[in-house]
Interface confidence: low
């Protein structure tokens, strides 16, 4: 139903706390360089304005769209051009072009320092002094670094953050309590960020239809007892919600997400038997719980998929009369039978089925032509299964750090033109798939591995798109979203690459490495490893092992030395010389 004042409507639906959080996220995602203080001032102004509209929907400007109101606020910021350059040109445009322009200027890799967590005592002091400001800083810092983070989900993580701090700041050993708990929240949030970026990429590049297909497959796996009509409704709603969030309509997105959760809880009987525990929770936790819900049990009496989609005499007629609906039902029926497949795989199977019908229904004897289609799925299913098997075996053998290094070598050989920081970030994230997925039961491994890898590779594509340097990466990133992972897996050593010349300074280290946290130390070593591969793309595993082992010993030795600086200065050149020799 239409509302006189959109902003009043959202304020009333969401409540002041969530409203303010979402406005802060929106501003932080659009203007990523502005300090917290500047954004919070705008948030307060918008909130005060929303309250006047709640009191009187006919008040001046209350009938304006939220994009108009937000855009006017952003464009009124002094020195916008000085800080944001081209983005200031957006302000000359009218809505909706102005918002589109803001969206195009979102930076997936903003030049911001890594978010440093303060030490425990300091964190607890500032949290206890002003929890609202503390959590506001958290929203701001995460949102500006992840401009496509799913806003209602970020509110949920802020709530989690709040819970952890409330609990741990009363403990005697605050750090021991905080560190593991905050690490867990951070890990989940980072995974959520890449997953949502993938959803927005899908929406931006391939439109709503592609996203809806993804949603149908995912919902059908989770809710195999729900009817197709129900799955279609849920997928349509989820597509609208994600479109809104990806498009910067964060208030509408969060409101609609809460509505969807309400609908699901009111219609549990026709959706899933597993929803009740989620439905007892407050709104943010309820939505999050529903998003992570375990799969319902598959109905016991499902007939073979072949009956409707291969053996039925009317296959071509049904397909011709309503292609999207028929293919949607195929995706639904196949997905509800296979919670053990990744969504990417299910979409590849649906695509193969569609291509088969397109070809066969134009031939003289369609049933004879499409009769073998299910058998033709076998190689498509085997490929990711083998990927999971070989990679999980490698992970079990090497551990997370060793597995990351193996992936780093592999990807640097595939795309040596890509910048080293991007390769290291991608390899570290890809390598985490082992810890995340390889320890799961067999039936959950494939969906976990492939859908996670797809999201990480999407991040690589997004970064590469900004400064394209590798034709191979461009080729894999330009194709269909579901074919990306197989495309990257199939890449081999780039034979066209001219090796980088050996620069001693790339492999020169100083005593500051000794005081770095373990993670930063690993990144330094992995940076050196990528540079070695760029210098010698065809180096053998043994050669690389020798050099990296030598390097680790050198760092260890010099960090234990009495005169660290002297050790690095004298031993460093020897290491460089030995490395060159080992790789010759």
């Amino acid at each position: 139903e239409a509302h006189k004042s959109e902003i009043a409507h959202r304020f009333k639906d969401l409540g002041e706390q969530h409203f303010k959080g979402l406005v802060l996220i929106a501003f932080s995602q659009y203007l990523q360089k502005c300090p917290y203080e500047e954004h919070i001032k705008l948030v307060q102004e918008v909130t005060d304005f929303a309250k006047t509209c709640v009191a009187d929907e006919n008040a001046e400007n209350c009938d304006k769209s939220i994009h108009t109101l937000f855009g006017d606020k952003l464009c009124a910021i002094p020195k916008l051009r000085d800080n944001y350059g081209e983005l200031a040109d957006c302000c000359a445009k009218q809505e909706p072009e102005r918002n589109e322009c803001f969206l195009q200027h979102k930076d997936d890799n903003p030049n911001l320092p890594p978010f440093q967590r303060p030490e425990a005592e300091a964190m607890c002091t500032s949290f206890q002094e002003n929890p609202t400001s503390f959590l506001g800083h958290y929203l701001h810092e995460v949102a500006r670094r992840h401009p496509y983070f799913y806003a209602p989900e970020l509110l949920y993580y802020a709530e989690k953050y709040n819970e952890v701090l409330t609990q741990c700041c009363t403990e005697s050993d605050k750090a021991a309590c905080l560190t593991p708990k905050l690490d867990a929240v951070k890990e989940k949030a980072l995974v959520a960020a890449v997953r949502q970026r993938m959803k927005c990429s899908s929406m931006q590049r391939f439109g709503e239809r592609a996203f809806k297909a993804w949603a149908v497959a995912r919902m059908s796996q989770r809710f195999p007892n729900a009817e197709f009509a129900e799955i279609t409704k849920l997928a349509t709603d989820l597509t609208k919600i994600n479109k809104e969030c990806c498009h910067g309509d964060l208030l509408e997105c969060a409101d609609d997400r809460a509505e969807l959760a309400k609908y699901m809880c009111e219609n549990q009987a026709t959706i899933s038997s597993k929803l009740q525990a989620c439905c007892d929770k407050p709104v943010l936790q309820k939505s999050q719980c529903l998003a992570e819900i375990e799969h319902d049990n598959i109905p016991a009496d499902l007939p073979s998929i072949a009956a409707d989609f291969v053996e039925d005499k009317e296959v071509c007629k049904n397909y011709a009369e309503a292609k999207d609906v028929f293919l949607g039902t195929f995706l639904y029926e196949y997905s509800r039978r296979h919670p053990d497949y990744s969504v990417s795989l299910l979409l590849r199977l649906a695509k193969k089925y569609e291509a088969t019908l397109e070809k066969c229904c134009a031939e003289g004897d369609p049933p004879a032509c499409y009769g073998t289609v299910l058998a033709e799925f076998q190689p498509l299913v085997e490929e990711p299964k083998n990927l999971v098997k070989t990679n999980c075996e490698l992970y079990e053998k090497l551990g997370e750090y060793g597995f990351q290094n193996a992936i780093l070598v592999r990807y640097t050989q595939k795309a040596p033109q890509v910048s080293t920081p991007t390769l290291v970030e991608a390899a570290r994230n890809l390598g985490r798939v082992g810890t995340k997925c390889c320890t799961l039961p067999e039936a959950q491994r494939l969906p976990c591995v492939e859908d996670y890898l797809s999201a990480i590779l999407n991040r690589l594509c997004v970064l590469h798109e900004k400064t394209p340097v590798s034709e191979k990466v461009t080729k894999c990133c330009s194709g269909s979203l579901v074919e990306r992972r197989p495309c990257f897996s199939a890449l081999t050593v780039d034979e066209t690459y001219v090796p980088k010349e050996f620069k001693a300074e790339t492999f020169t280290f100083h005593s500051d490495i000794c005081t770095l946290p373990d993670k930063e130390k690993q990144i330094k070593k992995q940076t050196a490893l990528a540079e070695l591969v760029k210098h010698k793309p065809k180096a053998t595993e043994d050669q690389l092992k020798t050099v990296m082992g030598d390097f680790a010993q050198f760092v260890d030795k010099c960090c234990k030395a009495a005169d660290k600086d002297n050790c690095f200065a004298t031993e460093g050149p020897n290491l460089v010389a030995r490395s060159k020799e080992a790789l010759a």
Epitope: F228, A229, T232, A269, T270, A322
Partner: nanobody
Framework: EVQLVESGGGLVQAGGSLRLSCAAS????????MGWFRQAPGKERERVVS????????YYADSVKGRFTISRDNAENTVYLQMNSLKPEDTAVYYC????????????????WGQGTLVTVSS
């Protein structure tokens, strides 16, 4: 052979009520979504209501919302249409239809059709 047989049509005064029934045979009733369509003289056939396989999901055209109610009895293989507050513009032949899969409610999604039953609403 699949058969859908409608009954319950007839002449009624404006503001009155009617209950249409559609008995299905020759198909696994609980595997089909069911719908009622109508066609007034000289007009295109339009969807009035639909109900999903388990009955948990329904669709109503705006023109009948709040006045018509669809229900189904899977044990009896029957779908019902309760029509209250009837108006002269509800006059039409009402068709029962079955859909193996139903998403958007377009006519082409429905696989089987009944012969229709006439409903006349006089003013």
């Amino acid at each position: 052979e699949v058969q859908l047989v409608e009954s319950g049509g007839g002449l009624v005064q404006a503001g009155g009520s009617l209950r249409l029934s559609c008995a299905a045979s020759g198909l696994t009733f609980s595997s089909y979504a069911m719908g009622w369509f109508r066609q007034a003289p000289g007009k295109e056939r339009e969807r009035v209501v639909s109900i999903s396989r388990g009955g948990g999901y329904t669709y109503y055209a705006d023109s009948v919302k709040g006045r018509f109610t669809i229900s189904r009895d899977n044990a009896e293989n029957t779908v019902y249409l309760q029509m209250n507050s009837l108006k002269p513009e509800d006059t039409a032949v009402y068709y029962c239809a079955a859909a193996r899969y139903w998403a958007t409610g377009s006519e082409y999604e429905f696989d089987y059709w009944g012969q229709g039953t006439l409903v006349t609403v006089s003013s």
